[in-house]
Interface confidence: medium
Amino acid sequence: DITPSVPPASYHPKPWLGAQPATVVTPGVNVTLRCRAPQPAWRFGLFKPGEIAPLLFRDVSSELAEFFLEEVTPAQGGSYRCCYRRPDWGPGVWSQPSDVLELLVTEELPRPSLVALPGPVVGPGANVSLRCAGRLRNMSFVLYREGVAAPLQYRHSAQPWADFTLLGARAPGTYSCYYHTPSAPYVLSQRSEVLVISWEDSGSSDYTRGNLVRLGLAGLVLISLGALVTFDWRSQNRAPAGIRP
C-alpha cells in the first residue's frame, strides 16, 4: 500500500473530495476532509502532491471516508487528493485520484484591489463601476463608503472579483472594499486601499472629453457650411448665359 499505482481512468473512477466547514478556514478550526467514492470501497487514502505514501488511511466498508484534521495550522494548508481501493484489486493499486482540494488556513485573506471603470472621474449623470478584485473564487464582496458605517453594497461572486455600480449623482466619495468566505467560519481579507471618486472638473482650462466632442462637431458644421457656400458661389459663376437659378 505504500506505493500506489494508478490504473487507466476508465478502470476505477475518481472519488470526490470536499472539506467541512470550508476550504478556507482560520487556524484552530477542526476540518473534516470527506472522500466519497462512486462505489463501496475498503480503504481510503489521503495524499499530498509529490508524496507516494498516503498522509492518512481510513479503512471503512462504505462509499464515504472522513479524515479529521484537528485544530488546523497554516502548515496543514495546501493541496490534497484522495484515492480508494478494494481488497480484490492488486497490491498497491488505487483508484484514479480525486480532483485537487486546496485547503487554505489563514487568519486573513490577501488585500483586494479596488479600481474604477472606466476611471475615478465621473461626469454629471454618468454611472461608474467599481471592481473589487481578490485572488479567490466564490467569495462575498463588501463595498464601504467613508462616513457610512453599514456596507454600501454586498455581493457574492463566483469570480475572484465583484463589480459594484454607482449612480453618477451619488458616486463621488471615498470607497474601500474587502471580501470574505461566504459561510462560517468567516475569514476576512484585509481592507483594500481607498479609492476616491470625484466629479469631472468642468471649470478647468483643459477641455474635457465632452467639450472636445462638442468642439469637433461645431468644427464639422462650420466646414460643411463653408464647403456649401463655396460650391454654391462657384456653380453660379460657371452657369451658361441666360440661365439663372
Epitope: 467541512q20 466547514p21 453599514a150 456596507p151 459561510s183 462560517a184 467560519p185 468567516y186 476576512l188
Partner: antibody, heavy 118, light 107 residues
Framework: QVQLVQSGAEVKKPGSSVKVSCKAS????????ISWVRQAPGQGLEWMGK????????NYAQKFQGRVTITADKSTSTAYMELSSLRSEDTAVYYC???????????WGQGTMVTVSS | EIVLTQSPGTLSLSPGERATLSCRAS???????LAWYQQKPGQAPRLLIY???SRATGIPDRFSGSGSGTDFTLTISRLEPEDFAVYYC????????FGPGTKVDIK
C-alpha cells in the same frame, strides 16, 4: 464547544418592543453568524434574520423587514434581537442559533418565551 | 423565497420500524444547503443532517439523509424510543426557510 445563553422570559403589551439577548461562550463569537429563529405555540420554526458580528452585516427575512433589528456586541460576545410593534401573533419562543457547520444551525440557545398580551 | 413541504404530517410507527420522511422544495435547493432537525417538546431543535446527507456530530448512524434538487428524504433505519419527535427540514441559502414538520409518534 460554543454555548449560547439567552435572557429570561418577557411579557409585553401590544405595540411595544422586546429586546432578547444571546451570550456566546467557549468559542470564536465574531467569526460566525448568529441567527434568530422563532416558534409560536404548537407551530413550526421561522427564521427571522442573522448577523455576522465580524462584518457587522445583517440579513433579515422579508416578513420581519423593518420590524426586527439584530445587533451584536463583540466585546461581550452577545447578540441582540429587538422586535418592535408587537402584536399577539408575536407570542412565541425566540431562539438564537449558531451555524458552525456551513450555515446549518448546530448550536442553539435555550429559548426565550415572549408573551404579547394586553 | 423557497417553500418547503413535508410529508406525511404525522407518521405513526412502532419502535424498531423504519421511518421515511419526505421534504419537497418549491424550487431547486443546492444539496449543500439542506438540513434536518429533530425537536422534542420543550426543547430547542437538534441538528441531525446537513448538506442533505452528512450526519452532524454525535448523531447515530441510524439517521441518514439523501436527495437532491427538490426532493429530499430523512430515513431512520430502526426507530428507538427516543426518536419519537417532530422533524423539520430546512434550506439555508441566503434566506433560510423551514418545512412545517413531520411528527413521528408511537403507534
Amino acid at each position: 464547544q460554543v454555548q449560547l445563553v439567552q435572557s429570561g422570559a418577557e411579557v409585553k403589551k401590544p405595540g411595544s418592543s422586546v429586546k432578547v439577548s444571546c451570550k456566546a461562550s467557549g468559542g470564536t463569537f465574531s467569526s460566525y453568524a448568529i441567527s434568530w429563529v422563532r416558534q409560536a405555540p404548537g407551530q413550526g420554526l421561522e427564521w427571522m434574520g442573522k448577523i455576522i458580528p465580524i462584518l457587522g452585516i445583517t440579513n433579515y427575512a422579508q416578513k420581519f423587514q423593518g420590524r426586527v433589528t439584530i445587533t451584536a456586541d463583540k466585546s461581550t460576545s452577545t447578540a441582540y434581537m429587538e422586535l418592535s410593534s408587537l402584536r399577539s401573533e408575536d407570542t412565541a419562543v425566540y431562539y438564537c442559533a449558531n451555524p458552525l457547520t456551513f450555515d446549518a444551525f448546530d448550536i442553539w440557545g435555550q429559548g426565550t418565551m415572549v408573551t404579547v398580551s394586553s | 423565497e423557497i417553500v418547503l413541504t413535508q410529508s406525511p404530517g404525522t407518521l405513526s410507527l412502532s419502535p424498531g420500524e423504519r421511518a421515511t420522511l419526505s421534504c419537497r422544495a418549491s424550487q431547486s435547493v443546492s444539496s449543500s444547503y439542506l438540513a434536518w432537525y429533530q425537536q422534542k417538546p420543550g426543547q430547542a431543535p437538534r441538528l441531525l443532517i446537513y448538506g442533505a446527507s452528512s450526519r452532524a456530530t454525535g448523531i447515530p448512524d441510524r439517521f441518514s439523509g439523501s436527495g437532491s434538487g427538490t426532493d429530499f428524504t430523512l430515513t431512520i433505519s430502526r426507530l428507538e424510543p427516543e426518536d419519537f419527535a417532530v422533524y423539520y427540514c430546512q434550506q439555508y441559502g441566503s434566506s433560510p426557510t423551514f418545512g412545517p414538520g413531520t411528527k413521528v409518534d408511537i403507534k
